[in-house]
């Protein structure tokens, strides 16, 4: 069954997905798709990376992390209820049927009505958008610099705790990285 992540309407949703490149710059193609991972590739592709860059993206879908270090977590900007559903992160490891597939379930909740205005984190300021329109070719990337690693063996329950998008964002802001693969 899919791991569940939550966000509110109007927020940015964060869906974590990571791998460890065999060597710096030795990247593995990754696709993100809407819908559970199929037998080959991704279904309705929203973003792709190749061995060098993000080479395909669609509006509102982008990578905040340093994908050159294997952080291919997906951010969906300004979510609506229609963004609910299963997303596939597919790490396309060379060789036949070697891909790692992760199905992540995104649940969008209606925005909370609060009597007093609350301070919202400015994601655009904190993490300038890397890509927001459909396109191809090389892209300038905003990296987060050198981050400390948290290994899965060190924190086995972190993935479950990441289910709330805001918690996920806080963890990411503090520099936590899950290593998969």
């Amino acid at each position: 069954s899919e791991v569940e992540y939550r966000a509110e309407v109007g927020q940015n949703a964060y869906l974590p997905c990571f791998y460890t490149p065999a060597a710096p710059g030795n990247l593995v193609p990754v696709c993100w798709g809407k819908g559970a991972c199929p037998v080959f590739e991704c279904g309705n592709v929203v973003l792709r990376t190749d061995e060098r860059d993000v080479n395909y993206w669609t509006s509102r879908y982008w990578l905040n992390g340093d994908f050159r270090k294997g952080d291919v977590s997906l951010t969906i900007e300004n979510v609506t209820l229609a963004d609910s559903g299963i997303y596939c992160c597919r790490i396309q490891i060379p060789g036949i049927m070697n891909d790692e597939k992760f199905n992540l379930k995104l649940v969008i909740k209606p925005a909370k009505v609060t009597p007093a205005p609350t301070r919202q984190r400015d994601f655009t300021a904190a993490f300038p958008r890397m890509l927001t329109t459909r396109g191809h070719g090389p892209a300038e990337t905003q990296t987060l610099g050198s981050l400390p690693d948290i290994n899965l063996t060190q924190i086995s329950t972190l993935a479950n705790e990441l289910r709330d998008s805001r918690l996920a964002n806080d963890l990411r802001d503090s520099g936590a990285t899950i290593r998969i693969g």
Partner: antibody, heavy 121, light 107 residues
Framework: EVQLVESGGGLVKPGGSLRLSCAAS????????MAWVRQAPGKGLEWVAN????????YYLDSLKSRFTISRDNAKNSLYLQMNSLRAEDTAVYYC??????????????WGQGTLVTVSS | DIQMTQSPSSLSASVGDRVTITCHAS??????IGWLQQKPGKAFKGLIY???NLEDGVPSRFSGSGSGADYTLTISSLQPEDFATYYC?????????FGQGTKLEIK
Amino acid sequence: EVQLVESGGGLVKPGGSLRLSCAASGFTFSDYYMAWVRQAPGKGLEWVANINYDGSNTYYLDSLKSRFTISRDNAKNSLYLQMNSLRAEDTAVYYCARGLYYYGGNYFAYWGQGTLVTVSS
Amino acid sequence: DIQMTQSPSSLSASVGDRVTITCHASQGISSNIGWLQQKPGKAFKGLIYQGSNLEDGVPSRFSGSGSGADYTLTISSLQPEDFATYYCVQFAQFPPTFGQGTKLEIK
């Protein structure tokens, strides 16, 4: 208009070989996975093999992978299926099908009319 | 391999009827299912992918639904050109597998 035209079928003796071809037009061939699917007389459809966009990954039905080889030539917009050590049970209509688009979608949106392969002594 | 059980195997209906064809997978396939149409003497044609997405150019009277292991193709109002054989295909797990087909005939 998307067109897929198979050729190369025919009558062959058991143990023989055939090479099927599929000429594609009307779309950017290199943006799509391609597949071969077959249908034996009076039987259902059976997926045979897939090939990814640039030919670097190929996938086969387990029972066929030692005898069949799928390949493609993107410069010629062509898909191929080399069939060796043919058996009577390989008798079928072989279809070329356009597979998954680089950006997602249907695995089998467009098909050719098929080419009949008959394996008989 | 995932087995796809399609029903009914044949169906008689009239122009204007609402028709439903079902496919049951031997295990959950998370909407990774497509529906195909084959008219006599014509090539197969994709109608629906990922359970409910209409292929370009397919009339809106066709729709797909379902979840888990059970999926449905519905034609809301049959037209003369819809009489054909319909197949489901799963692409959730290797290898892709097909249903046995439903032949839709004029009553």
